[in-house]
Protein backbone atom coordinates (compact mmCIF):
# COMPACT_ATOMS: atom_id res chain seq x y z
CA UNK A 1 0.00 0.00 0.00
CA UNK A 2 1.90 3.31 -1.17
CA UNK A 3 2.02 5.90 1.98
CA UNK A 4 -0.77 8.83 2.00
CA UNK A 5 1.37 10.91 4.44
CA UNK A 6 4.85 11.14 5.14
CA UNK A 7 6.70 11.70 8.51
CA UNK A 8 8.72 15.29 9.78
CA UNK A 9 11.20 16.26 7.01
CA UNK A 10 9.68 13.98 4.52
CA UNK A 11 7.64 14.83 1.12
CA UNK A 12 5.24 12.56 -0.65
CA UNK A 13 6.17 12.31 -4.60
CA UNK A 14 5.20 9.46 -7.09
CA UNK A 15 3.60 7.71 -4.18
CA UNK A 16 6.62 7.49 -1.98
CA UNK A 17 8.24 9.41 1.26
CA UNK A 18 11.34 11.28 0.06
CA UNK A 19 14.09 13.44 2.38
CA UNK A 20 13.60 17.11 2.18
CA UNK A 21 16.61 19.36 1.65
CA UNK A 22 17.88 20.74 5.01
CA UNK A 23 18.22 24.42 5.27
CA UNK A 24 21.42 25.53 2.92
CA UNK A 25 20.53 23.54 -0.01
CA UNK A 26 18.22 22.85 -2.36
CA UNK A 27 16.56 20.04 -4.46
CA UNK A 28 18.43 18.17 -7.57
CA UNK A 29 16.12 15.29 -7.93
CA UNK A 30 13.60 13.46 -6.00
CA UNK A 31 14.40 10.06 -4.32
CA UNK A 32 13.29 6.63 -6.36
CA UNK A 33 12.63 3.61 -5.30
CA UNK A 34 16.67 3.18 -5.63
CA UNK A 35 18.07 6.62 -4.86
CA UNK A 36 17.94 8.94 -2.16
CA UNK A 37 17.03 12.37 -2.69
CA UNK A 38 19.65 14.73 -4.02
CA UNK A 39 20.43 18.19 -2.41
CA UNK A 40 23.27 20.86 -3.28
CA UNK A 41 24.46 23.89 -1.29
CA UNK A 42 23.53 27.14 -2.14
CA UNK A 43 25.29 29.32 -3.83
CA UNK A 44 27.77 32.60 -2.04
CA UNK A 45 24.90 35.06 -2.17
CA UNK A 46 21.76 32.11 -1.51
CA UNK A 47 20.00 30.79 1.30
CA UNK A 48 17.43 28.51 2.30
CA UNK A 49 16.40 28.34 5.87
CA UNK A 50 13.95 25.27 6.21
CA UNK A 51 13.93 22.15 5.42
CA UNK A 52 12.56 22.01 2.03
CA UNK A 53 11.83 20.68 -1.77
CA UNK A 54 12.99 24.17 -3.27
CA UNK A 55 14.83 24.06 -6.62
CA UNK A 56 16.03 27.33 -6.38
CA UNK A 57 17.97 28.73 -3.05
CA UNK A 58 16.48 32.54 -2.37
CA UNK A 59 18.71 35.32 -3.15
CA UNK A 60 19.62 37.55 -0.23
CA UNK A 61 18.67 40.67 0.57
CA UNK A 62 21.01 43.65 -0.34
CA UNK A 63 21.33 46.67 2.03
CA UNK A 64 21.16 49.52 -0.88
CA UNK A 65 23.55 52.00 0.45
CA UNK A 66 21.98 54.35 -1.63
CA UNK A 67 18.27 53.72 0.70
CA UNK A 68 20.75 54.56 3.70
CA UNK A 69 20.98 50.58 4.51
CA UNK A 70 24.08 48.47 5.44
CA UNK A 71 24.73 45.04 6.55
CA UNK A 72 23.24 44.25 10.11
CA UNK A 73 24.01 40.92 9.90
CA UNK A 74 25.76 38.83 6.77
CA UNK A 75 23.84 35.94 5.31
CA UNK A 76 24.52 32.47 5.71
CA UNK A 77 23.42 29.42 3.48
CA UNK A 78 20.38 29.15 6.11
CA UNK A 79 20.11 32.62 6.81
CA UNK A 80 19.21 35.85 4.75
CA UNK A 81 21.37 39.13 5.19
CA UNK A 82 19.91 41.56 7.73
CA UNK A 83 19.96 45.20 7.13
CA UNK A 84 19.89 48.21 9.21
CA UNK A 85 20.17 52.09 8.78
CA UNK A 86 22.96 54.29 9.05
CA UNK A 87 23.86 55.73 12.23
CA UNK A 88 20.78 58.75 12.81
CA UNK A 89 18.15 56.92 10.42
CA UNK A 90 15.07 54.38 11.14
CA UNK A 91 13.95 51.61 9.29
CA UNK A 92 10.65 51.88 8.39
CA UNK A 93 9.26 48.65 8.56
CA UNK A 94 10.74 45.21 10.49
CA UNK A 95 12.01 43.97 7.39
CA UNK A 96 13.96 47.61 7.30
CA UNK A 97 13.50 48.08 3.24
CA UNK A 98 13.98 51.62 3.35
CA UNK A 99 15.19 54.22 6.15
CA UNK A 100 13.96 57.82 7.34
CA UNK A 101 15.08 60.27 10.02
CA UNK A 102 12.66 59.41 12.43
CA UNK A 103 9.02 58.12 12.57
CA UNK A 104 5.73 60.55 12.74
CA UNK A 105 3.14 59.93 15.11
CA UNK A 106 -0.25 59.56 13.66
CA UNK A 107 -3.74 61.17 15.12
CA UNK A 108 -4.68 59.83 17.85
CA UNK A 109 -1.09 60.05 19.08
CA UNK A 110 1.47 62.08 20.48
CA UNK A 111 5.18 62.93 20.72
CA UNK A 112 6.70 61.27 24.02
CA UNK A 113 9.77 61.85 22.99
CA UNK A 114 12.10 63.18 20.18
CA UNK A 115 13.91 61.24 18.10
CA UNK A 116 17.54 61.48 18.58
CA UNK A 117 20.95 59.64 16.89
CA UNK A 118 20.09 56.44 18.79
CA UNK A 119 16.24 56.61 19.75
CA UNK A 120 13.27 57.03 16.91
CA UNK A 121 10.27 58.75 17.67
CA UNK A 122 8.39 57.67 20.42
CA UNK A 123 4.59 57.99 20.46
CA UNK A 124 2.02 57.61 22.90
CA UNK A 125 -1.97 57.56 22.66
CA UNK A 126 -3.59 60.73 23.64
CA UNK A 127 -5.71 60.24 27.03
CA UNK A 128 -9.15 61.46 27.45
CA UNK A 129 -9.71 65.54 27.48
CA UNK A 130 -5.83 65.66 24.80
CA UNK A 131 -6.12 64.94 21.08
CA UNK A 132 -3.98 65.62 18.11
CA UNK A 133 -5.50 65.89 14.45
CA UNK A 134 -1.95 65.51 12.92
CA UNK A 135 1.09 63.36 11.72
CA UNK A 136 3.61 64.47 13.73
CA UNK A 137 7.00 64.20 15.07
CA UNK A 138 7.44 66.85 17.26
CA UNK A 139 3.79 67.71 18.07
CA UNK A 140 2.26 66.67 21.50
CA UNK A 141 -1.50 65.78 22.58
CA UNK A 142 -3.58 69.20 22.95
CA UNK A 143 -6.19 69.54 25.19
CA UNK A 144 -9.41 70.13 24.08
CA UNK A 145 -10.90 73.11 24.38
CA UNK A 146 -12.58 74.37 27.43
CA UNK A 147 -15.75 75.80 26.43
CA UNK A 148 -16.94 77.03 29.83
CA UNK A 149 -14.22 79.63 30.10
CA UNK A 150 -15.37 80.63 26.89
CA UNK A 151 -19.19 80.73 28.32
CA UNK A 152 -19.93 78.29 25.97
CA UNK A 153 -20.77 74.48 25.92
CA UNK A 154 -20.08 71.43 24.26
CA UNK A 155 -22.09 70.82 21.21
CA UNK A 156 -20.11 67.79 19.76
CA UNK A 157 -17.75 65.88 22.14
CA UNK A 158 -13.66 65.70 21.63
CA UNK A 159 -12.26 62.25 20.38
CA UNK A 160 -8.24 61.07 20.20
CA UNK A 161 -8.41 63.11 17.14
CA UNK A 162 -10.29 66.08 17.37
CA UNK A 163 -11.15 68.99 19.63
CA UNK A 164 -14.63 69.40 21.11
CA UNK A 165 -16.89 71.67 19.40
CA UNK A 166 -17.89 74.41 21.38
CA UNK A 167 -21.56 76.47 20.82
CA UNK A 168 -23.76 79.47 22.32
CA UNK A 169 -25.76 78.34 25.33
CA UNK A 170 -29.65 77.61 24.61
CA UNK A 171 -31.67 80.81 26.14
CA UNK A 172 -34.22 80.05 27.95
CA UNK A 173 -37.66 81.96 26.14
CA UNK A 174 -39.90 83.52 28.45
CA UNK B 1 11.32 63.97 -7.28
CA UNK B 2 11.71 65.93 -4.04
CA UNK B 3 14.85 67.96 -3.77
CA UNK B 4 16.20 70.11 -0.70
CA UNK B 5 18.36 72.51 -1.39
CA UNK B 6 20.11 74.49 1.82
CA UNK B 7 21.62 77.57 1.36
CA UNK B 8 23.20 80.64 3.61
CA UNK B 9 25.65 78.84 5.45
CA UNK B 10 29.39 80.43 5.83
CA UNK B 11 32.08 81.21 8.26
CA UNK B 12 30.55 83.77 11.11
CA UNK B 13 32.01 84.72 14.29
CA UNK B 14 30.86 84.04 17.43
CA UNK B 15 28.19 86.10 18.30
CA UNK B 16 27.04 86.58 14.59
CA UNK B 17 24.04 85.98 12.61
CA UNK B 18 23.07 84.09 9.63
CA UNK B 19 19.80 83.14 7.84
CA UNK B 20 19.41 79.63 6.40
CA UNK B 21 17.22 78.50 3.68
CA UNK B 22 16.00 75.41 2.16
CA UNK B 23 14.39 75.51 -1.09
CA UNK B 24 12.06 72.70 -1.82
CA UNK B 25 10.58 70.99 -4.58
CA UNK B 26 8.85 67.52 -6.29
CA UNK B 27 6.32 67.69 -3.28
CA UNK B 28 3.40 69.73 -1.99
CA UNK B 29 5.20 71.93 0.39
CA UNK B 30 2.66 73.37 2.12
CA UNK B 31 1.10 69.83 3.70
CA UNK B 32 4.54 68.92 5.36
CA UNK B 33 6.23 69.45 8.95
CA UNK B 34 9.31 70.84 8.20
CA UNK B 35 13.06 70.18 10.02
CA UNK B 36 16.08 71.26 10.37
CA UNK B 37 18.40 68.99 11.65
CA UNK B 38 22.81 69.72 11.94
CA UNK B 39 25.68 67.35 12.10
CA UNK B 40 28.85 68.56 13.49
CA UNK B 41 32.15 67.12 12.62
CA UNK B 42 32.45 63.58 13.68
CA UNK B 43 29.12 63.57 15.44
CA UNK B 44 25.38 62.34 15.03
CA UNK B 45 22.69 64.21 13.60
CA UNK B 46 20.88 66.12 16.22
CA UNK B 47 17.51 67.50 15.49
CA UNK B 48 17.33 71.08 16.00
CA UNK B 49 13.56 72.48 15.36
CA UNK B 50 10.28 71.88 13.54
CA UNK B 51 7.50 73.63 12.21
CA UNK B 52 4.00 72.63 11.54
CA UNK B 53 2.70 72.41 8.02
CA UNK B 54 0.62 75.91 8.89
CA UNK B 55 3.42 77.34 10.43
CA UNK B 56 1.09 77.71 13.84
CA UNK B 57 3.39 75.51 15.71
CA UNK B 58 7.14 74.88 16.15
CA UNK B 59 10.15 72.97 18.23
CA UNK B 60 13.19 73.91 19.02
CA UNK B 61 16.07 71.85 20.56
CA UNK B 62 17.37 73.31 24.03
CA UNK B 63 20.98 74.08 22.68
CA UNK B 64 19.31 76.75 20.33
CA UNK B 65 16.17 77.77 22.19
CA UNK B 66 15.93 81.47 22.02
CA UNK B 67 18.78 82.22 19.68
CA UNK B 68 17.36 79.96 16.65
CA UNK B 69 14.13 80.87 14.74
CA UNK B 70 12.42 78.46 11.98
CA UNK B 71 9.91 79.81 9.14
CA UNK B 72 8.46 78.88 6.38
CA UNK B 73 6.83 80.70 3.26
CA UNK B 74 4.44 77.97 1.64
CA UNK B 75 4.13 80.74 -1.34
CA UNK B 76 7.74 80.13 -1.91
CA UNK B 77 8.12 76.88 -0.87
CA UNK B 78 10.85 77.82 1.12
CA UNK B 79 12.11 76.80 4.64
CA UNK B 80 14.37 79.68 7.12
CA UNK B 81 16.25 79.00 10.05
CA UNK B 82 17.56 82.46 11.84
CA UNK B 83 20.80 82.29 13.75
CA UNK B 84 21.86 84.08 16.23
CA UNK B 85 24.45 84.79 18.80
CA UNK B 86 25.79 82.03 17.08
CA UNK B 87 28.80 80.40 19.55
CA UNK B 88 31.60 77.54 18.07
CA UNK B 89 28.93 74.58 18.62
CA UNK B 90 26.90 75.69 16.48
CA UNK B 91 29.80 75.30 13.68
CA UNK B 92 27.85 72.06 11.75
CA UNK B 93 26.63 70.77 8.53
CA UNK B 94 22.90 72.34 8.56
CA UNK B 95 20.04 69.87 6.43
CA UNK B 96 16.73 70.76 5.86
CA UNK B 97 14.17 67.67 6.09
CA UNK B 98 10.33 67.02 5.16
CA UNK B 99 7.95 64.48 7.28
CA UNK B 100 8.60 61.47 6.63
CA UNK B 101 12.16 61.89 5.12
CA UNK B 102 13.34 58.90 3.19
CA UNK B 103 17.34 59.13 2.92
CA UNK B 104 17.55 58.61 -0.75
CA UNK B 105 15.80 62.33 -0.71
CA UNK B 106 18.20 64.08 1.78
CA UNK B 107 19.86 67.19 0.87
CA UNK B 108 23.93 68.17 0.07
CA UNK B 109 23.23 70.29 3.42
CA UNK B 110 24.91 73.63 4.10
CA UNK B 111 28.24 74.65 5.91
CA UNK B 112 27.86 76.86 9.18
CA UNK B 113 31.24 77.40 10.57
CA UNK B 114 31.42 79.70 13.77
CA UNK B 115 35.22 80.55 14.51
CA UNK B 116 36.98 84.02 15.50
Known amino acids: EPPTACREKQYLINSQCCSLCQPGQKLVSDCTEFTETECLPCGESEFLDTWNRETHCHQHKYCDPNLGLRVQQKGTSETDTICTCEEGWHCTSEACESCVLHRSCSPGFGVKQIATGVSDTICEPCPVGFFSNVSSAFEKCHPWTSCETKDLVVQQAGTNKTDVVCGPQDRLRA | EVQLLESGGGLVQPGGSLRLSCAAS???????EMWWVRQAPGKGLERVS?????????YYADSVKGRFTISRDNSKNTLYLQMNSLRAEDTAVYYCAKLPQLFQDWGQGTLVTVSS
Open chain 2, 50 to 58: AINPQGTRT
Open chain 2, 26 to 32: GFTFRDY
